[in-house]
Interface confidence: low
């Protein structure tokens, strides 16, 4: 079976690295410099990625994988394959239209990305906030008063962080 | 009221120095990217540099080894330091507020600095 | 280098009239609407017009607008007024953090 698609279509043998070369009768020529091709039969190859400016080569391209960017400092990757960067704020900051701007009081973000998120309500599970939240860090929920009694957990540990969003472009 | 204010401008020889600074009042200068342009007279607006919120700074390439920009967020203050000044140098420059995503928003009045022998 | 060339580089205009300027970039600004535009007046500092290709600044009065993708851009003011008589500038960013401004179009009276 192979043999006769090979036969059929000759590209399909040749392997990730190589493209098939219509212009020398269809043989297997290896991907020029700065492209790659990632797949076998391919009949070209793509362009390498170039990670220019505010992109910085996080991984190079090899002749079967294209190269891999993310962001120099003051910037963060926004889309899939770091396909944006976006600029940093402060922690305590968002970015909005008018530039970074402090979390409003009951919000917080730990990034120097991302938006303001709000406290988490300790009361919603039946704690007491034991350190107080702020522009930069979330609240941290300490027992309810009911659970202060002799022998109990003294500090609950805080709930994982949520995953923040992207602002808003 | 919400301004910016060049200074440090003036009348110098080629081959020194000067630092132009950029007084911000009104709102947090550490909230803003900083950017400077300039303009010769008679000619258009040329894109200087700019000093992001982390102190990060990127520049023109015709400026680039000799300019540099920084910012002092506790004095509200965004500086230009401008070495081996030449003849062309000569211009009005100009510090604006804002960042890349969303253009610069606000700027101040501008401060002649003129380079000659 | 980059080249942002902006056209015309005059325009005679009067009060009333639909007054439309482009903007043509050597290669794309940054995510294809990284421009603004600009006003700026004799002996002033420029103003804030458009950003991000369309949108609009604050404060600035809606017959301005701006469109366009890529590499060309267009500010439009839609009924000159008096006060709009200045010269204009677009902006582009690039990959590489620069910032380019256009040569700039100056609108006139006619």
């Known amino acids: 079976f192979e043999r006769t698609r090979s036969l059929q279509d000759p590209c399909s043998n040749c392997p990730a690295g190589t493209f098939c070369d219509n212009n020398r009768n269809q043989i297997c020529s290896p991907c020029p410099p700065n492209s790659f091709s990632s797949a076998g039969g391919q009949r070209t190859c793509d362009i390498c990625r170039q990670c220019k400016g505010v992109f910085r080569t996080r991984k190079e391209c090899s002749s079967t994988s294209n190269a891999e960017c993310d962001c120099t400092p003051g910037f963060h990757c926004l889309g899939a394959g770091c396909s944006m960067c976006e600029q940093d704020c402060k922690q305590g900051q968002e970015l909005t239209k008018k530039g970074c701007k402090d979390c409003c009081f009951g919000t917080f973000n730990d990034q120097k990305r991302g938006i303001c998120r709000p406290w988490t309500n300790c009361s919603l599970d039946g704690k007491s906030v034991l350190v107080n939240g702020t522009k930069e860090r979330d609240v941290v929920c300490g027992p309810s008063p009911a659970d202060l009694s002799p022998g109990a957990s003294s500090v609950t540990p805080p709930a994982p962080a949520r995953e923040p969003g992207h602002s808003p472009q | 009221e919400v301004q910016l204010v060049e200074s440090g401008g003036g009348l110098v020889q080629p081959g020194p120095s000067l630092r132009l600074s950029c007084t911000a009042s009104?709102?947090?200068?550490?909230?803003?990217?900083m950017t400077w342009v300039r303009q010769a007279p008679g000619k258009g607006l040329e894109y200087i540099g700019f000093i992001n919120v982390g102190g990060d700074t990127s520049y023109a390439s015709s400026v680039k080894g000799r300019f540099t920009i920084s910012r002092d967020d506790s004095k509200s203050i965004a500086y230009l330091q401008m070495n081996s000044l030449k003849t062309e140098d000569t211009a009005v420059y100009y510090c604006?507020?804002?960042?890349?995503?969303?253009?610069?928003?606000?700027w101040g009045q501008g401060t002649l600095v003129t380079v000659s022998s | 280098d980059i080249q942002m060339t902006q056209s015309p580089s005059t325009l005679s205009a009067s009060v009333g009239d639909r007054v439309t300027i482009t903007c043509q970039s050597s290669q794309s600004v940054y995510s294809n609407s990284f421009l603004s535009w600009y006003q700026q007046k004799p002996g002033k500092a420029p103003k804030l017009l458009i950003y991000?290709?369309?949108d609009l600044a604050s404060g600035v009065p809606s017959r301005f607008s701006g469109s366009g993708s890529g590499t060309e851009f267009t500010l439009t003011i839609s009924s000159l007024q008096p006060d709009d008589f200045a010269t204009y500038y677009c902006?582009?960013?690039?990959?590489?953090?620069?910032?380019?401004f256009g040569g700039g179009t100056k609108v006139e009276i006619k």
């Open positions: 604006g507020r804002g960042g890349l995503t969303f253009g610069w928003d606000l």
């Open positions: 902006a582009g960013v690039y990959s590489d953090n620069t910032y380019v």
């Open positions: 991000s290709a369309s």
């Open positions: 009104g709102f947090s200068l550490s909230h803003y990217w």
